[in-house]
């Protein structure tokens, strides 16, 4: 899989490029410099920076917590009026307690009604989610295996035979019509049977070409 090994024998280099073992490393390999430079930041400086970052994060969390407290305070102040007890005697205070208790009972009733609605909505959402999963189950897509190939081989596999057509993979994979559902299900079965045969690049090429 590694390329350029013959060149390495003829021309010795001061820092050889790291051997790519996976195609997933390709992008990183292309963007990174071949010779890795040693970090100029000392361990103590790194620790200092880490501590600083932690401090900033802590301050940010504290600020968020303070904001939440402030928001709660603001919300409560709009809902709960400050008690006006000046000039009220025992009789009024007693009656005020009765009024406030009645208000609490009313709010409790409303809360119960809202909770019932929320529970109903949660149940409906769960049912709909289940229906979505059930519908998805009818149109299973093949699970593609990761294949270790070079970038050139991959480009050839993708563009070689069908260079003229655009590579809109979604269009290829998602063209499902209602009348073809049975056919699709049969295909899914075939995929499972021939999974080993199709796991190679040739098999994948065949699938794209069909």
């Amino acid at each position: 899989m590694a390329d350029g090994s013959s060149d390495a024998a003829r021309e010795p280099r001061p820092a050889p490029a790291p051997i790519r073992r996976r195609s997933s490393n390709y992008r990183a390999y292309a963007t990174e410099p071949h010779a890795k430079k040693k970090s100029k930041i000392s361990a103590s400086r790194k620790l200092q920076l880490k501590t600083l970052l932690l401090q900033i994060a802590k301050q940010e969390l504290e600020r968020e917590a303070e904001e939440r407290r402030g928001e709660k305070g603001r919300a409560l102040s709009t809902r709960c009026q400050p008690l006006e007890l000046a000039g009220l005697g025992f009789a009024e205070l007693q009656d005020l307690c009765r009024q406030l208790h009645a208000r609490v009972d009313k709010v409790d009733e409303e809360r119960y009604d809202i909770e019932a609605k929320v529970t109903k909505n949660i149940t409906e959402i769960a049912d709909l989610t289940q229906k979505i999963f059930d519908l998805r189950g009818k149109f299973k897509r093949p699970t593609l295996r990761r294949v270790r190939i070079s970038a050139d081989a991959m480009m050839q596999a993708l563009l070689g035979a069908r260079a003229k057509e655009s590579l809109d993979l979604r269009a290829h994979l998602k063209q499902v019509k209602k009348e073809d559902t049975e056919k699709e299900n049969r295909e899914v079965g075939d995929w499972r049977k021939n999974i080993d045969a199709l796991s190679g690049m040739e098999g994948r090429k065949k699938k794209f070409e069909s």
Epitope: Q81, E84, A86, G87, L88, G89, F90, A91, E92, L96
Partner: antibody
Framework: EVQMVESGGGLLKPGGSLKLSCAAS????????MSWVRQTPEKRLEWVAT????????YYPDSVKGRFTISRDNAKNTLYLQMLSLRSEDTAMYYC??????????????WGQGSSVTVSS | DIQMTQTSSSLSASLGDRVTISCRAS??????LNWYQQKPDGTIKLLIY???RIHSGVSSRFSGSGSGTDYSLTISNLEQEDIATYFC????????TFDTGTKLELK
């Protein structure tokens, strides 16, 4: 000098509505709870309504609850009594009074001159 | 509701007399009892609050006493300006209630 002046009274038919006003002066109005008390033609005194200093809380006897509404405007030093669905038994002299308390005891320490309301068909 | 009752609706007395007006509550009102005076012109004034406290500007000839359910207002050395109707009011429970009043007249 503490003073209360009522206005807005009159003669009206049963089922009618009326709004009484009371202009207060001579004291820091917003520091006191206020009340309305009426006196029937038989000279009986009946407490009608009380409102807290900022207007958040109001108190009524069952006889007027749901029909009468006490309110206040601290900026204008004015107390109001909105009366709806008036009945013949609401016929009375309506007094505006400053309310105070001592060790929890509730009393009206200063009263206005009254405003007459007559409900008759 | 707490009912307030006075022993007599009217009372006759002579100038200089000591007059006592009584008031009873249908239940214990813990001294939350107030007395008012209404003059013939309709003017209402607070005289006594919390059973025995004299309101500012009120003559010391007026005094109040009592506890539990029984209370009284006393006018010592009755004067012409005291001729009025006197009401008691409980400040213990909503609704605040008044008695029917005692009309004080000269003999």
């Amino acid at each position: 000098e503490v003073q209360m002046v009522e206005s807005g009274g009159g003669l009206l038919k049963p089922g009618g509505s009326l709004k009484l006003s009371c202009a207060a002066s001579g004291f820091t109005y917003s520091n006191y709870a206020m009340s309305w008390v009426r006196q029937t033609p038989e000279k009986r005194l009946e407490w009608v309504a009380t409102i807290s200093t900022g207007g958040s809380y109001s108190y009524y006897p069952d006889s007027v609850k749901g029909r009468f509404t006490i309110s206040r405007d601290n900026a204008k030093n004015t107390l109001y009594l909105q009366m709806l669905s008036l009945r013949s038994e609401d016929t009375a002299m309506y007094y505006c009074a400053r309310k105070d308390n001592y060790y929890g005891s509730t009393f009206m320490d200063y009263w206005g001159q009254g405003s007459s309301v007559t409900v008759s068909s | 509701d707490i009912q307030m009752t006075q022993t007599s609706s009217s009372l006759s007395a002579s100038l200089g007399d000591r007059v006592t007006i009584s008031c009873r509550a249908s239940q214990d009102i813990t001294q939350y009892l107030n007395w008012y005076q209404q003059k013939p012109d309709g003017t209402i004034k607070l005289l006594i609050y919390y059973s025995s406290r004299i309101h500012s500007g009120v003559s010391s000839r007026f005094s109040g006493s009592g506890s539990g359910t029984d209370y009284s207002l006393t006018i010592s050395n009755l004067e012409q300006e005291d001729i009025a109707t006197y009401f008691c009011q409980q400040g213990n429970t909503i609704p605040l209630t008044f008695d029917t009043g005692t009309k004080l007249e000269l003999k």
